[in-house]
């Protein structure tokens, strides 16, 4: 035999201060007749919550029309909800009687619970950058949430992270509740345009978490690799001369050119490139002049990047038999 | 006046979702007091029920459907649709589309669709 | 689910003949019943809401009777467009459900 089902499907709805609550509450039957009523806490102390028929209830909207003889949708929406609303409601069906309705049956309950959003996650990265294959330390944290059941999952690029650790405050009850998690992420030559990414999911964001991020470009120093060739072209008495430092961030970056040991003060002409990694390249050229008496010139570029020690390499300039003769023909 | 156009593919292959939508036109879907019906009839045979959508978003489903059956509206468009997933053989049938009126029988239909389930 | 029993299944009778159909509900269901009528090749229509109530632009020689577990549609004199099956419908519990269809003819 079929009977009445009072279906109310959220066994905890979380609200925010101020906001609406949508209490639902179906019924599988349109048997016995009879109306159907609401109420807050059960025995006889239970509060009347909505009427349809008689009473006076400001804050209560039904989602329905109850006065479809056919509606099965008993659902209703409380406004401008405070903390004094939480509590468990229920919806009750009574027979329709004389003298008056008798409760028929009534719905399992919902548990009204105020809810608080966390807050934006915030990521911090270290203080200092750190080189390739290196670990790293990210830490994220979000404040104000409400319950305490939160869930943090850390991503690189899109990939998830599993070295992390997380702690959520305080441990026993609250009004509000904190998290911190703190991710090690081992650095690759090509992160600079990396992103780590601190998601956060709570019940009150409905599924669409919260998201908070940090660029690798601000933790991760490439250091540059430098090659110093002699261009097997001359211009007339001088020959061209290139360092390349190749494949460095930032950008930051001083180059100098020595000539046996005595730092070189005139003009050079440079290059500077961006790769697709985000990294840089940098072309500097050093015209040396060739005459008789220089007969062995050591030329050394040096590179001082991001403040760390300077780095150089040196190239012992070949000039030929016939570049000097050539040079001294054509000195008068 | 208030008439309802069912639309959808003809032809589902087995273990697809059917996927159909019922136009409104000449009257709102969002007013009040309308409930939104899909029924269903297999080739030769009777009228099977398939679920409601109330103006307010409620849905009820017939309990032999209940976990392949989706209903939703779309206020926007003035549309309500009908998915139904896993389908087979036994999903091959002529799907209408109609509406509740405010006492209680479904006081208007759309023509219906036919929909087979064929690979 | 509420059982709907239809009967007959189908039936013949002349124009101007009182026809009578019955539906009985596998419990009572009060009078939250509707009646139906498809043409074939076309939609239902309905005829009858609420057991007796009928509906808009519907011809009076339609009626409906019956309250709990037994109901009646009858159609008090034949006529050529009436061709079609007749449904019964209950909307008391969930799922709806509708009887397995009544198919008039003509002699």
């Known amino acids: 035999e079929e009977e009445l089902q009072m279906i109310q499907p959220e066994k905890l709805l979380l609200v925010t201060v101020g906001k609406t609550a949508t209490l639902h509450c179906t019924v599988t039957s349109l048997l016995p007749v009879g109306p159907v009523l609401w109420f807050r806490g059960v025995g006889p102390g239970r509060e009347l919550i909505y009427n349809q028929k008689e009473g006076h209830f400001p804050r209560v909207t039904t989602v329905s029309d109850l006065t479809k003889r056919n509606n099965m949708d008993f659902s209703i929406r409380i406004s401008s909800i405070t903390p004094a609303d939480v509590g468990t409601y229920y919806c009750v069906k009574f027979r329709k009687g004389s003298p008056e309705n008798v409760e028929f049956k009534s719905g399992p309950g919902t548990e009204m619970a105020l809810g608080a959003k966390p807050s934006a996650p915030v990521v911090l990265g270290p203080a200092a950058r750190t080189t390739p294959e290196h670990t790293v330390s990210f830490t994220c944290e979000s404040h104000g949430f409400s319950p305490r059941d939160i869930t943090l999952k850390w991503f690189k690029n899109g990939n998830e992270l599993s070295d992390f650790q997380t702690n959520v405050d305080p441990t026993g009850q609250s009004v509000a509740y904190s998290i911190r998690s703190t991710a090690r992420v081992v650095l690759d030559p090509w992160d600079v345009r990396s992103q780590v990414i601190c998601e956060v999911a709570h019940v009150t964001l409905q599924g669409d978490p919260l998201r908070g991020t940090a660029n690798l470009s601000e933790a991760i120093r490439v250091p540059p690799t430098l090659e110093v060739t002699q261009q097997p072209m001359r211009v007339g008495n001088q020959v061209n001369v290139t360092c390349q430092v190749r494949k460095f961030y930032p950008q930051s970056l001083q180059l100098t050119w020595s000539e046996n040991g005595n730092v070189c003060q005139r003009e050079t002409a440079s290059t500077l490139t961006e790769n697709k990694d985000g990294t840089y390249n940098w072309t500097s050229w050093f015209l040396v002049n060739i005459s008789d008496q220089r007969d062995d010139v050591v030329l050394t570029c040096q590179v001082k990047h991001d403040g760390q020690l300077a780095v150089s390499k040196r190239l012992a300039l070949e000039v030929t038999v016939h570049q000097k003769d050539q040079s001294s023909d054509a000195t008068p | 006046q208030v008439q309802l156009q069912e639309s959808g593919p003809g032809l589902v292959k087995p273990s697809q979702t059917l996927s159909l939508t019922c136009t409104v036109s000449g009257g709102s879907i969002s007013s009040g007091g309308w409930y939104w019906q899909w029924i269903r009839q297999h080739p030769g045979k009777g009228l099977e029920w398939i679920g409601t959508i109330y103006y307010s978003g409620s849905t009820f489903y017939n309990p032999s459907l209940k976990s392949r059956v989706t209903i939703s509206v779309d206020t926007s468009k003035n549309q309500f649709s009908l998915k139904l997933s896993s389908v087979t053989a036994a999903d091959t049938a002529v799907y209408y589309c109609a509406r509740e009126g405010y006492h209680s029988g479904m006081d208007v239909w759309g023509q219906g669709t036919t929909v087979t389930v064929s690979s | 689910d509420i059982q709907m029993t239809q009967s007959p299944s189908s039936l013949s009778a002349s124009v101007g003949d009182r026809v009578t159909i019955t539906c009985q509900a596998s419990q009572d269901i009060s009078n939250y019943l509707n009646w139906y009528q498809q043409k074939p090749g076309k939609a239902p229509k309905l005829l009858i809401y609420d057991a007796s109530n009928l509906a808009t632009g519907v011809p009076s020689r339609f009626s409906g009777s019956g309250s709990g577990t037994d109901f009646t549609f009858t159609i008090s004199s034949l006529q050529p467009e009436d061709i079609a099956t007749y449904y019964c419908?209950?909307?008391?519990?969930?799922?709806?459900?509708f009887g397995g269809g009544t198919k008039v003819e003509i002699k």
């Open positions: 419908q209950q909307f008391a519990y969930l799922p709806w459900t």
